[in-house]
């Protein structure tokens, strides 16, 4: 056959799909390849044939669209399973082709299985709830284009294992879970379960996300640098080592990057010629508010390192600050017997 | 403990009407759907009916659909089931059953059921 | 409507024994069934959801496996309370729809 451009295995949409669900599977070559859609490509006598490679086989088959009740189907660019089973578990390609033209990519579709609690492998988005911010929705994701706008489904919402029913803060509406007031309580997997008719049968659609309460941008606040501070001076001979820690508090800020960094004399660590070492460390708090700690280390300080401007900067989406740390050369200790002569007036 | 008390049953002559109720207590009623489930004699189960646990869906089995109407009045922990132009085959003991939290539809308390008998 | 097959109809054994009821979905059900133990006169009980899950209280001898269409109750060794009516529901989707029930009788 002539040559087809091939995409390969695309693992970038590694898609997964409940067993015992309907599942509709769009063929990525009009999503993320081409600069068509699948009208054009009918349009101009171009052919969209589905193949599939089954787990743990090299083999290359046509798929079954005859299967009892059109088990597995194809509508436009959409492969359709009416329900999955495991063993649809595989790498599949959609082809589009005609006479002088063809283009192919493989994507891998793995079908996993669910328990009561709604437990599985799946990969499970995260939305995240600011805390204590008013009403706040979650949709149920993933599931238009199963049934027509003149279907009227029902929503079973679950938290865990148990449906959301008479729950004080969390109220069902249709698609939408509110939640009225977020608490960190309210962290946890949540499920929809949506129910429709279709051709005689009733279908299940099992979605799960994960909910995150996190920090409201109403408390947010700039940068906090806790160290270094005031309070503390770093004094030291030459020839010790000189830490100083840089620990600064981060309010949670949607989609905001924390950078913590150390300038000695105004300059990056690695454009001087210092043999200076920086370690950090990140921990969160339940609400994602975040604690980074640079630890600046000169292993054997010299008396012009002690001289030296150090200082700790910090940015986030709220703003920039930063914070000199006090450092200075200990005074030696006047030997004791010069002491003692000057003590008793001696000359 | 949980407690459900069917009443309202008796006999009725086919077309006859006929309101059963169920009185619940011991846990948070207003947190479950409730269901009716009626058994004739000597045979098998059938589910009836299904009220949310808000009252916000309704659901029948097709051979009472439009004369049987399932309600609950969640400020006086009860269900109650109206039974309109009733047939013969409806005869059956009528039991209320509480839905479990756990996923699907399913039944974790029973009632003793009441007896409906319609014959003329 | 989803079909619930129950077999056996009616089932003899033995104190002790093991032993193993069945139930088929007309379509698939995922873990979506049910089952309920029903003695003369009484309402009947729930012994098994969501097709493994022992409900609080009822003896570990019970257990339930399937999914999709085949699912099973299995007593482990049948102990002389255990002579009833068994039931499988489906709880997939109104209506919802029970098996026919299997009695099991002293042998």
């Known amino acids: 056959s002539e040559r087809c451009d091939d995409w390969g295995l695309d693992t970038m949409r590694q898609i997964q799909v409940f067993e015992d669900e309907p599942a509709r599977i769009k063929c990525p070559l009009f999503e993320h390849f081409l600069k068509f859609n699948y009208s054009t490509a009918h349009s101009a006598g171009l052919t969209l044939i589905w193949y599939w490679t089954r787990q743990d086989r090299d083999l290359e088959e046509p798929i079954n669209f005859r299967l009892p009740e059109n088990r597995i189907s194809k509508e436009k660019d959409v492969l359709w399973f009416r329900p999955t089973l495991l063993n649809d578990t595989g790498n599949y390609t959609c082809m589009l082709r005609n006479t002088t033209y063809c283009s192919k990519v493989a994507f891998p579709l793995e079908v996993v299985q669910k328990d009561s609690c709604f437990n599985s492998p799946m990969k499970l988005p995260v939305h995240k709830l600011y805390i204590e911010y008013g009403i706040q929705r979650i949709t149920c994701p993933n599931v238009d284009g199963y049934f027509p706008s003149s279907v009227k489904p029902t929503i079973t919402w679950y938290m865990g294992c148990y449906k959301i029913q008479n729950f004080n803060n969390v109220i069902p509406e249709g698609m939408n879970l509110s939640f009225l007031i977020a608490l960190i309580s309210n962290n946890g997997n949540y499920t929809c379960v949506v129910t429709y008719p279709e051709n005689g049968r009733t279908f299940h659609l099992t979605r799960t996300l994960t909910v995150k309460v996190v920090g409201s941008p109403k408390n947010a606040v700039p940068p906090v640098i806790h160290s270094p501070n005031d309070h503390v001076v770093y004094e030291k001979e030459p020839g010790e080592e000189l830490l100083i820690p840089c620990t600064v508090y981060f309010s949670f800020l949607m989609d905001s990057r924390n950078e913590v960094w150390w300038t000695i004399d105004g300059k990056k660590p690695d454009d001087i010629t210092i043999d200076v070492t920086i370690n950090e460390s990140i921990s969160h708090s339940r609400t994602e508010d975040e604690t980074r700690t640079q630890i600046l280390s000169i292993k054997k300080v010299t008396s012009e390192d002690l001289k030296r401007s150090y200082v700790c900067h910090a940015r986030s989406a709220k703003g920039e600050v930063a914070k000199a740390a006090k450092v200075k050369q200990k005074v030696p200790a006047p030997r004791y017997t010069v002491e003692l002569a000057c003590g008793f007036g001696a000359t | 403990q949980v407690q459900l008390v069917e009443s309202g049953g008796g006999v009725v002559q086919p077309g006859g009407s006929l309101r059963l109720s169920c009185a619940a207590s011991?846990?948070?009623?207003?947190?479950?759907?409730m269901h009716w489930v009626r058994q004739a004699p000597g045979k098998g189960l059938e589910w009836v009916a299904v009220?949310?646990?808000?009252?916000?869906?309704?659901f029948y089995t097709d051979s009472v659909q439009g004369r049987f109407t399932i309600s609950r009045d969640n400020s006086k922990n009860t269900l109650n089931l109206q039974m309109n132009s009733l047939r013969a085959e409806d005869t059956a003991v009528y039991y209320c059953?509480?839905?479990?939290?756990?996923?699907?539809?399913?039944?974790?308390?029973w009632g003793q059921g009441t007896l409906v008998t319609v014959s003329s | 409507d989803i079909q619930m097959t129950q077999s056996p109809s009616s089932l003899s054994a033995s104190v002790g024994d093991r032993v193993t009821i069945t139930c088929r979905a007309s379509?698939?059900?995922?873990?979506?069934s049910n089952w309920y133990q029903q003695k003369p006169g009484k309402a009947p009980k729930l012994l098994i959801y969501?097709?493994?899950s022992l409900q609080s209280g009822v003896p570990s001898r019970f257990s339930g496996s399937g999914s999709g269409t085949d699912f099973t109750l299995t007593i482990s060794s049948l102990q002389p309370e255990d002579f009833a009516t068994y039931f499988c529901?489906?709880?997939?989707?109104?209506?919802?729809?029970f098996g026919g029930g299997t009695k099991l009788e002293i042998k």
């Open positions: 059953a509480r839905e479990g939290l756990r996923a699907g539809y399913y039944f974790d308390f």
């Open positions: 529901q489906q709880s997939h989707s109104t209506p919802l729809t």
């Open positions: 011991g846990f948070t009623f207003s947190s479950h759907g």
């Open positions: 009220i949310w646990y808000d009252g916000s869906n309704k």
């Open positions: 379509q698939r059900i995922s873990f979506y």
């Open positions: 969501a097709a493994s």
